[in-house]
Interface confidence: medium
């Protein structure tokens, strides 16, 4: 019988409210044996895959997606899925990244910790269609 794949979780370090120009790392977590983690942007518009998967604990693997210098266009909704042969998982919940005007410099600690994992299958179809794109930044050619 095919194994049931647990939903991945997503979190952001150092948090989900990031000053302009600072860095953020999305952390996707799933079970051991994951081959590929995928970080998706907004309503499955664009994505980034990595096979650079490490073991976070005896029962968990993770992948990290880093944005070195956050711009306004990086604001938005992110989620993770993973591929554990021969199946793709369901999606994690969405995590919203907010970008704010820098006040205390790149190392300013004014960020909020953020993570997203939960029992719901996927957000209801109205949960993210009010989020309009940021006015500038992210090029259509790249996830970030």
């Amino acid at each position: 019988q095919e194994e049931d794949l647990p939903r991945p979780s997503i979190s952001a370090e150092p948090g989900t409210v990031i000053p302009l120009g600072s860095h953020v790392t999305f952390v996707c977590r799933g079970p051991v044996g994951v081959q590929t983690f995928r970080l998706e942007r907004d309503s499955r518009s664009t994505y980034n895959d990595t096979e650079d998967v490490s073991q976070a604990s005896p029962s968990e693997s993770e992948a990290r997606f880093r944005i070195d210098s956050v711009r306004e266009g990086n604001a938005g909704l992110y989620r993770c899925i993973y591929y554990k042969p021969p199946k793709w998982s369901e999606q994690s919940d969405y995590l919203e990244l907010l970008v704010k005007e820098s006040s205390g410099g790149p190392d300013s600690p004014d960020t909020e910790p953020g993570s997203s994992a939960g029992p719901t299958q996927r957000p209801s179809d109205n949960s993210h269609n009010e989020h309009a794109p940021a006015s500038q930044g992210l090029k259509a050619e790249h996830l970030y």
Epitope: S43, S45, W88, N129, P133, A134, G137, K139, A140
Partner: antibody, heavy 122, light 107 residues
Framework: EVQLQQSGPEVLKPGASVKISCKAS?????????MNWVKQSHGKSLEWIGY????????SYNQKFKGKATLTVDKSSSTAYMELRSLTSEDSAVYYC??????????????WGQGTSVTVSS | DVQMIQSPSSLSASLGDIVTMTCQAS??????LNWFQQKPGKAPKLLIY???NLEDGVPSRFSGSRYGTDFTLTISSLEDEDMATYFC?????????FGGGTKLEIK
């Protein structure tokens, strides 16, 4: 070769319901692909109705088609369905199923069915 | 909803011409923009995804570009078989929305 084979044309009376099918072949139906449904009224543009994720049946609808369209799948036969209810002349159109594929970091409707014509007439 | 304003609604050009058509998004630049070609009685066919990526098997005379919220489809040397209607699609924000279409005719 990926193929989406839709059911044949339908002529129906106002108030009736219809269930259109879209049989997928050439790829793993329950892999990470979504199935979209798109409406094209005569000589007009395209409208996205909604999508369904065959893996778990999760759906997302265009608000405009909520209550009008219901999307379902039968994993055993790799078939997606769209039911339209309480039909009026406004529902007369060609309806397409279209797979959401992914390529080079983008999602897109890469394969389309041939379309199913629905005519509502008294 | 993100509206996609496509122009012109129709155009006529000669074989060998350079042809351009545009879609303007009502908001946002972070859009995965797709272009489709549709011939009468047929389903739409994917040409371009991610604003500028050419789908496999599509002739290289087709290209896509983006400037801000404006997206352009260019046919570098028009051929007979290009007579069709072209649609753009924003595939980022729900509900996904299509442009109104550009009907291309050969002079």
């Amino acid at each position: 070769e990926v193929q989406l084979q839709q059911s044949g044309p339908e002529v129906l009376k106002p108030g009736a319901s219809v269930k259109i099918s879209c049989k997928a072949s050439g790829y793993t139906f329950t892999d990470y692909y979504y199935m979209n449904w798109v409406k094209q009224s005569h000589g007009k543009s395209l409208e996205w109705i909604g999508y369904i994720y065959p893996n778990n049946g999760a759906t997302s609808y265009n608000q405009k088609f909520k209550g009008k369209a219901t999307l379902t799948v039968d994993k055993s036969s790799s078939t997606a369905y769209m039911e339209l209810r309480s039909l009026t002349s406004e529902d007369s159109a060609v309806y397409y199923c279209a797979r959401d594929g992914y390529s080079s970091n983008y999602y897109t409707m890469d394969y389309w069915g041939q379309g199913t014509s629905v005519t509502v007439s008294s | 909803d993100v509206q996609m304003i496509q122009s012109p609604s129709s155009l006529s050009a000669s074989l060998g011409d350079i042809v351009t058509m545009t879609c303007q998004a009502s908001q946002g630049t972070s859009i995965n923009l797709n272009w489709f070609q549709q011939k009468p009685g047929k389903a739409p066919k994917l040409l371009i995804y991610g604003a500028s990526n050419l789908e496999d098997g599509v002739p290289s005379r087709f290209s896509g570009s983006r400037y801000g919220t404006d997206f352009t489809l260019t046919i570098s040397s028009l051929e007979d078989e290009d007579m069709a209607t072209y649609f753009c699609l924003q595939h980022t924000y729900l509900p996904y929305t299509f442009g109104g279409g550009t009907k291309l005719e050969i002079k």
